[in-house]
C-alpha cells in the first residue's frame, strides 16, 4: 500500500465559496500531493479551516482495520470531517495521511435509474460472492425475493419506487461492495427502523467489514460500545478522543459542562443538503478512481 | 428514568379502526427516529412503521396505505392510525424510540422499548 501524506499551508477553505470553486481548488492542491511508503494507519493531526472554522484542531489516529465511531450534535462537523477525509475540504493547517481507496456512505441515500444489481455494483467489476455476501449483510435478501425481476428490477426513472429504508440499505451495500481500504459511514442507519439497523450493525459493519478500517458518524450510545476508538465532536472541536470505557469515566464531567448545548451550521439545512449532495455527485462520478 | 406507555389497544371487528399512541417520559433531552413494532404469537419482532425526527416515515409493506404513523414533538408522543384492520393485525404493538437522555452528553441516544399493547382483530 503507498501512503498519501497530505500537507497543506495556509489554504482557506469557505463553505460560502460555493462547492464549485471549492472543488476546483481542491484538485489543484490534488497536484501538489507527494506519495510516499508507510503504514497502514489513517493519521489526522492539527485540522482547522481559515474564516469559518467548520473543524478546529483535531487529532487522531486509527489503525488499519478499526473501528473510528464519529459522534456529536448537529452542525457539530461530523460530515465536514468525511468530506476533509475525501479531500472534499482543505485544511489550513495541519496534515491527513491515510493509505489507499476510499468508499463513502452518504446520510441521504440516492438511487439511479437502473437495475437493483447496478445500483450496488455501480461500475465495480461483478464478484457473485461478494455480492451475495453484502446483500446478505445489508438485510437485503429478502426485498429482492419479493421483486418478480429480482436484483434486475429497474430502479428510478419508469422503475419501481423503494421506501426510505430500502434506499438507505441500498446504498449502504454499494459503498460496502466496492472494495475499498478505509470506508466512511455518514449516519448509514438513519432511515432505518431498530431491528434492521442492529442486524446491519451486527452483520455488516462489524463481521462482513471487520478487517477494514471503518469511520462511523453515529450517536447511538451500542456502536459507540463496540468501536475501537470513538472521537466526540463540539461545535469543530475535538471534545473526546479514545474508548468507549474512557468516554465512561468521563461522562459525568463533559455531561455538566455541555448540558443542552446544540450547534448548528451557519448555513440552512438547504443550503448544506445541497453542497453534500454536489459533492456526492461529483465524489460518485469520480468512481473507483483512488480518492487518496 | 425514561419510559414509554402505550395505549389503545383492543379488540376489533375486521374492516374497523384503532389509534395506538405513545408518549416517552422522564428526564428527556430529545427524540430521535420513534416507530411502532409488532409480534404475534411464535412469530419474530417486525416492523411496522417508523418515522423521523422531521417527519418522514416508513412502513411495512403490509401495512402501506391503511396505517399512518405521526408524532407530536412537543408531547414526545407517536400514534399509530390503524384503518381496514384484518384478522391478520393480530399481534402485541410495541413502541420504540431513540432518546437523548438529559443526562447523555453530545445527543447521544439509547433505545428504549414499551411494554406493548395487544391489539386483537377478530373475523
Known amino acids: 500500500l503507498t501512503t498519501t501524506e497530505v500537507v497543506m499551508e495556509n489554504v482557506t477553505a469557505f463553505w460560502e465559496e460555493g462547492f464549485g470553486e471549492l472543488f476546483e481548488k481542491a484538485k489543484q492542491n490534488n497536484n501538489n500531493r507527494k506519495t510516499s511508503n508507510g503504514d497502514d494507519s489513517l493519521f489526522f493531526s492539527n485540522f482547522s479551516l481559515l474564516g469559518t472554522p467548520v473543524l478546529k484542531d483535531i487529532n487522531f489516529k486509527i489503525e488499519r482495520g478499526q473501528l473510528l465511531a464519529v459522534a456529536g450534535s448537529t452542525g457539530a462537523g461530523k460530515t465536514s470531517l468525511l468530506m476533509m477525509i475525501m479531500g472534499e475540504l482543505e485544511p489550513s493547517e495541519g496534515k491527513i495521511k491515510h493509505s489507499g481507496r476510499i468508499s463513502f456512505c452518504p446520510q441521504f441515500s440516492w438511487i439511479m435509474p437502473g437495475t437493483i444489481k447496478e445500483n450496488i455494483i455501480f461500475g465495480v467489476s461483478y464478484d457473485e460472492y461478494r455480492y451475495r455476501s453484502v446483500i446478505k449483510a445489508c438485510q437485503l435478501e429478502e426485498d429482492i425475493s419479493k421483486f418478480p425481476e429480482k436484483d434486475n428490477t429497474v430502479l428510478g426513472e419508469g422503475g419501481i419506487t423503494l421506501s426510505g429504508g430500502q434506499r438507505a440499505r441500498i446504498s449502504l451495500a454499494r459503498a460496502v461492495y466496492k472494495d475499498a481500504d478505509l470506508y466512511l459511514l455518514d449516519s448509514p442507519f438513519g432511515y432505518l427502523d431498530v431491528l434492521t439497523e442492529k442486524e446491519i450493525f451486527e452483520s455488516c459493519v462489524c463481521k462482513l467489514m471487520a478487517n477494514k478500517t471503518r469511520i462511523l458518524v453515529t450517536s447511538k450510545m451500542e456502536h459507540l460500545k463496540k468501536a475501537d476508538k470513538i472521537l466526540i465532536l463540539h461545535e469543530g472541536s475535538s471534545y473526546f478522543y479514545g474508548t468507549f470505557s474512557e468516554l465512561q469515566n468521563l461522562q459525568p464531567d463533559f455531561s455538566s459542562k455541555l448540558m443542552g448545548c446544540d450547534s448548528f451550521d451557519q448555513f440552512s439545512a438547504e443550503r448544506r443538503n445541497s453542497i453534500l449532495t454536489e459533492t456526492l455527485h461529483r465524489f460518485s462520478l469520480e468512481g473507483d478512481a483512488p480518492v487518496s | 428514568q425514561v419510559q414509554l406507555q402505550e395505549s389503545g389497544g383492543g379488540l376489533v371487528q375486521a374492516g374497523s379502526s384503532l389509534r395506538l399512541a405513545c408518549a416517552a417520559t422522564?428526564?428527556?433531552?430529545?427524540?430521535?427516529?420513534m416507530g411502532w413494532y409488532r409480534q404475534a404469537p411464535g412469530k419474530q419482532r417486525g416492523m411496522v412503521a417508523i418515522?423521523?425526527?422531521?417527519?418522514?416515515?416508513d412502513y411495512a409493506d403490509s401495512v402501506k396505505g391503511r396505517f399512518t404513523i405521526s408524532r407530536d414533538n412537543a408531547k414526545n408522543t407517536v400514534y399509530l392510525q390503524m384503518n381496514s384492520l384484518k384478522p391478520e393485525d393480530t399481534a402485541t404493538y410495541y413502541c420504540?424510540?431513540?432518546?437523548?437522555?438529559?443526562?447523555?452528553?453530545?445527543?447521544?441516544?439509547?433505545?428504549?422499548w414499551g411494554q406493548g399493547t395487544q391489539v386483537t382483530v377478530s373475523s
Open positions: 420504540h424510540a431513540e432518546i437523548t437522555e438529559q443526562s447523555r452528553p453530545f445527543y447521544l441516544t439509547d433505545d428504549y
Open positions: 422522564g428526564s428527556i433531552r430529545s427524540i430521535n427516529n
Open positions: 418515522i423521523t425526527r422531521v417527519g418522514n416515515t
